[in-house]
Structures are given as C-alpha cells and as structure tokens.
Amino acid sequence: MSRSNRQKEYKCGDLVFAKMKGYPHWPARIDEMPEAAVKSTANKYQVFFFGTHETAFLGPKDLFPYEESKEKFGKPNKRKGFSEGLWEIENNPTVKASGYQSSQKKSCVEEPEPEPEAAEGDGDKKGNAEGSSDEEGKLVIDEPAKEKNEKGALKRRAGDLLEDSPKRPKEAENPEGEEKEAATLEVERPLPMEVEKNSTPSEPGSGRGPPQEEEEEEDEEEEATKEDAEAPGIRDHESL
C-alpha cells in the first residue's frame, strides 16, 4: 500500500490518515499544498490533526486517503485526542482550531459561512463551519501508550471523565493557554522538528497530538499509566 501511496497527490481539504514516527495513523486533513520555494517543506503537505488540532508537515508517503484507509486505521484507541479525531473527521471535517491562522502559502480556499439552519436533528454530517474564538491552548503532546497497558486502561469515556485520580493533575486541561500546562504535564514533549514552528494552537481541553516516541525507557510504565489517567479519551469506572 505504501508504494502506491508514495505517488499520491493530495489537495487542500482532502481527508487522510497521517503517519508520524511513534504515532498511530492519525485522522487528519490537508491544509496546505507543498511550497517548492521553501526547502524545508518542499514536497510536504501541511496536515491538520483532528482531535488535537495541531499541524505538521508530512510527505505523501506518510499520508493515506481516509476513505480507503478507515477500515484499517480507523479503530478507536486510547491515545489522547485520537477518538475525538475519528469523531471530528466524520462529523465536523472542516473544523479549525481556535485562533487558527493559515499562512499565505498554497492554503485552502476559505469556504463561505454556511446557512445557520442545519438539517433537523443536526443530521448534516458535512458542514463548512469555521471556528472562531480567542483562546489559544499550548502545544503539548503525550507519550505513546505502551501495549502492556492496553488492557484495563480503556476505562474513560464521556460522562466518566472526571474520576478522582491522584495521578491526574488538577489543571491538566487549561483553556487559556497559560504556562502552567507545560509545567503540570512534564511528561509531555513538543512535537518533532517537522512540525511547523508556528503551528496551530490546540483547543482548550483537547487531547494532545499524535504522541512522540518514548525517550526514557525506565519511566515508560509509570508515565503511560499517568497518561491514561489524564487522557480524555480513556474511560474509567463510574464513581458515583
């Protein structure tokens, strides 16, 4: 699959699964075309990650068409932001991070604002809404979850997100983009160098981007467990 995938060309707005080292294939959208004049991003697309609302530059070999690949890569997993991303790519594919400013390269054409009346029961799955708000979250990502923690860790879901856990920092979710988030979540590290320097701020309370590979082996288990406790996409037992 990857061989034919290398030849694939994408256009703005295309939905894909994007692969970064240490990350699962992540639901994403092509936001900008390659700019040949800029050496560092030549032949690389700017990709917007659903769920985390972060961006990165990736080459076509790391991009996989969404519709063709969703059976293979579209299984929910416990990475922070991943399952929210699966929901967004299906239900809200034009979502933009708050404070999002596209650079003046070959970016996607702005779509007109939709009519305010959506279909009954909010049944219109594909809309053209563009978010707009003042908040800008800090860019942080989480560590990879280790396979040994897979079983028994999938315990947090909507309605069970605020379980009391000594390992969950009280301010793990910080919508105002303050510095304390970086201090609180020390296990989280910035995205790899390929990520755009002025990349899109993640949304308040969002899961973090596709996680980077672990750097310190001895802390793996403890940190993965901590991550599980913090992750909005991981369900826990009802405490009430």
Epitope: E135, A158, L162
Partner: antibody, heavy 120, light 106 residues
C-alpha cells in the same frame, strides 16, 4: 445520514410503567465508541439527561432516577429501549433519544422527541 | 452530582449586538462542556463542544470559552435566526444541563 426516532405511548396513567423505543439508522450500536442517550424536557423547562447505553452494554443512569430507569439495546434491530416505572404527572415531558460518541463530544444527533403525558 | 447554573435566565438584545451567556459548574469540569441551541418545538442542536469547538454547520459568530467552573457562549453579532433557548451541558461526570437562557429580540 444519522437519524433517530422515538416511539411509545403519548399518554400513561400514574403508577404505570413507560416504555419508549428509539429506532435509529446511519450508525450501529455494535460499533466501538457509540452510545445512545435518553434526555427529557418537561413543558417550558430545562433538559434533563436520563440514561446512556454504550456499545459494550456499559450503562449510566441519572442518580436521582436510577431506581426507576432501565435502558437496553437490540443491536440487530437498531433500537434502544428505555423503561421508566411508577410514572407520575411530573414525568410529563418530551422524551428525546440522542447519539453520543464515547469520547469528548456532545449529543450531536437527536430524535425529534415524543411527548408523553402522565395523567389519570 | 454536578450542577450547572446559567445566567441570565432570559436576555433581550438587539440585532447586531454582541451577546454573552454564562454557565457555572458546581465543580471544576476541565472544559468538558457543550452548548446547545433549541428553538420552540424542535430538538436541541449541538453548537459548541469541548468548550470552544464549533460543531459542523454552526456559523462562526458563535464562540465558546472558559475554564475550571466558569464558561461562556458568545454571539458576536446577533442575527434573527439566533433567537432560541441556549443550554450548557457538562459531560465530565455523567451529564447535566444548565437551566437554559432564553434569548429574545429587543
């Protein structure tokens, strides 16, 4: 296209048991991450969440109504059933079912609602 | 239980006005907050999820913000079709809605 539709009696007597059915299309309750919730709204009042059932049969109930509620699903029929015992006139409301995703998103798809009146 | 308190309970504003509706949770809900719009005789519609993300098809004049226990929904320029009742909803511990804010034209 995701659609949900509630059905059941429009009138029940006090002390009786209400049984409501939510029939949906466009998704499956056998799909990982999917849930269906029931929410009600008395005339002129606020929304009140009642119960949620997940694809894996993990259920949640409103604590103040838990003893009266049961939520079940029939995956093959694409249906979720809510039963509410010992109905009282204060339970008169429009009852909605809605689809929910396992993770951090809202009730994105709702049925049109069905008005249930409790009266003798 | 987590209680959600909206203010004001009703609000009159002129077309073109900037309108803000507040929602306070009885405990920190870590941004697990949604906003819904409901028009008479209709089911609610999801407007904003995860504190500030606009749902599909929602005009960009709507925005959400907040943290901890305090959240708000803002309409930057009120339009006739925005007349409705707005509900906040937390989903951190089970699900609870605010009592609603009825928005009317002045």
């Amino acid at each position: 296209q995701i659609t949900l539709k509630e059905s059941g009696p429009t009138l029940v007597k006090p002390t009786q048991t209400l049984t409501l059915t939510c029939t949906f299309s466009g998704f499956s309750l056998s799909t990982s991450g999917i849930g269906v919730a029931w929410i009600r709204q008395p005339p002129g009042k606020a929304l009140e969440w009642l119960a949620t059932i997940w694809w894996d049969d993990d259920n949640r109930y409103n604590p103040s109504l838990k003893s009266r509620l049961t939520i079940t699903k029939d995956t093959s029929k694409n249906q979720v059933v809510l039963t509410m015992t010992n109905m009282d006139p204060v339970d008169t409301a429009t009852y909605y079912c809605a689809q929910i995703y396992d993770y951090a998103v809202g009730f994105a798809y709702w049925g049109q609602g069905t008005l249930v009146t409790v009266s003798s | 239980d987590i209680q959600m308190t909206q203010s004001p309970s009703s609000l009159s504003a002129s077309l073109g006005d900037r309108v803000t509706i507040s929602c306070r949770a009885s405990q920190d809900i870590s941004n697990y907050l949604n906003w819904y719009q409901q028009k008479p005789g209709k089911a609610p519609k999801l407007l904003i999820y995860y504190t500030s993300r606009l749902h599909s098809g929602v005009p960009s004049r709507f925005s959400g913000s907040g943290s901890g226990t305090d959240y708000s929904l803002t309409i930057s320029s009120l339009q006739p079709e925005d007349i409705a009742t707005y509900y906040c909803q937390q989903y951190g511990k089970l699900w609870t809605f605010g009592q609603g804010t009825k928005l009317e034209i002045k």
